[in-house]
Amino acid sequence: QCKILRCNAEYVSSTLSLRGGGSSGALRGGGGGGRGGGVGSGGLCRALRSYALCTRRTARTCRGDLAFHSAVHGIEDLMIQHNCSRQGPTAPPPPRGPALPGAGSGLPAPDPCDYEGRFSRLHGRPPGFLHCASFGDPHVRSFHHHFHTCRVQGAWPLLDNDFLFVQATSSPMALGANATATRKLTIIFKNMQECIDQKVYQAEVDNLPVAFEDGSINGGDRPGGSSLSIQTANPGNHVEIQAAYIGTTIIIRQTAGQLSFSIKVAEDVAMAFSAEQDLQLCVGGCPPSQRLSRSERNRRGAITIDTARRLCKEGLPVEDAYFHSCVFDVLISGDPNFTVAAQAALEDARAFLPDLEKLHLFPSD
């Protein structure tokens, strides 16, 4: 899609910090009076060249977009007005990494796109990690070890923070069913200075691409572009995305006609959100009005509770939340393949949880 808004946001951010140099007086508004310093023409020209470059890169997808054409003409006008040469340096995008203290320690600068290494160097210890998962009905395991079965329909945010946006779209498992299953997952890795261009990953049932929406398999041409990568061990059924620049690993799977999502993410990254971003299933679990108790079963097909329990017990010997979710899903869907989703979710939790004592959750209801 047309990325003029992103180009504009990068331009605006890069000009916020422009100071000094060049004929700053020419840029001063006629409002208050003359100032020393100010936005230097040299800096402005660099920012305008970057803006122009960004618009050229997105031009193909912006045909007929009024905002795009307005911006292109505006850039051209300002470059002429300030005698900016077409060639020359461009402005780097603004710094946007997770705020970490202690950068001025005298040690060689840690790689800004290796979150774990950077954190360890600055704090003398590895970062804390959090785990969240959504699978089956969907059942959501939150960062804080809440385990809910959700009746959510439509698009709901699993994560919405300064670095990541993850949205799950759910629809009813079957006509008239109370339970829903995730049919689509959208993940946005937000633009980060030296590391990555904004990347969007979208998966739908029967379409798990091993590439981002723009066809790439990494974070782009920036120096740290390789700090975001996408791979698979089982094409069509499994995708793993590594985002080393934010200390994050995501696994997406397809089983029994639904998608499951699992994430291991650095604590600072997971918690980098504002009060307005408070609806995140990974943070607060399902809103109370959207929770299903396991007694709300409309069973489909011929699978009895005993059969469901036996099927689930094979791969999930401990009668924990994963086991009960499995029984719930098999009963509601009538599909024995739903056992795989719960088993895979437990395996991801085993790999992702920093504290294995929290692996098995035992629900109260």
Partner: antibody, heavy 122, light 107 residues
């Protein structure tokens, strides 16, 4: 000397929309940012968003994303701010303010409109 | 968003007193900080930009200092016309965010 003159006070019902205008005179309009800042009764200042008219692309604070639309008409040197799905908490004075330097929001806002009071009440 | 914390929220001082207001940013904002004055019923007015630069036409009794996360605004000798609310504002990142304001009154 640049001046910003805003449209008059408005009383609106919850759920409706309001569109406030801000006309610039006495200086260059198109290449300076115009920000919209609101102030609820007895409260502080809150940046809603802004536009650099020459680029035609608005920037919004996340809090207002989807509910606010900021536009600019270069031919009349007027900026507009439209806020939809109004609720009682949107009762406030809405100011437009011009950036102190060309082509950036940086270095502050040195010319302000007189403010437009918007009251949302059923 | 970057949070700006201003203190005190209000103060009362005598004419001629030295008045100091502090502003703290939730992350390093270098010196990209502005101070505004708002008199009752009026629009804000830019007094200081880039933490310490006085806007043209602003009396020299107003000054600002600081860098990184901690900033100070000073009125060296309070005058009756200085009765107003003063706001700090960061401009290192969008959205530009303001402190909660400090109301200055005369004793």
């Amino acid at each position: 000397q640049v001046q910003l003159v805003q449209s008059g006070a408005e009383v609106k019902k919850p759920g409706s929309s309001v569109k406030v205008s801000c006309k610039a005179s006495g200086g260059t309009f198109r290449s300076y940012s115009i920000s919209w800042v609101r102030q609820a009764p007895g409260q502080g200042l809150e940046w809603m968003g802004g536009i650099i008219p020459i680029f035609g692309v608005a920037n919004y604070a996340q809090k207002f994303q989807g509910r606010v639309t900021i536009t600019a008409d270069e031919s009349t040197s007027t900026a507009y701010m439209e806020l939809s799905s109004l609720r009682s908490e949107d009762t406030a004075v809405y100011y437009c303010a011009r950036g102190a330097y060309e082509a950036t929001y940086g270095l502050g806002m040195d010319v302000w409109g007189q403010g437009t009071t918007v009251t949302v009440s059923s | 968003d970057i949070q700006m914390t201003q203190s005190p929220s209000s103060l009362s001082a005598s004419v001629g007193d030295r008045v100091t207001i502090t502003c703290q940013a939730s992350q390093d904002i270098s010196n990209y900080l502005n101070w505004y004055q708002q008199k009752p019923g009026k629009a804000p007015k830019l007094l200081i930009y880039d933490a310490s630069n006085l806007e043209t036409g602003v009396p020299s009794r107003f000054s600002g200092s600081g860098s990184g996360t901690d900033f100070t605004f000073t009125i060296s000798s309070l005058q009756p016309e200085d009765i107003a609310t003063y706001y700090c504002q960061q401009l290192v990142d969008l959205p530009p965010t303001f402190g909660g304001g400090t109301k200055v009154e005369i004793k």
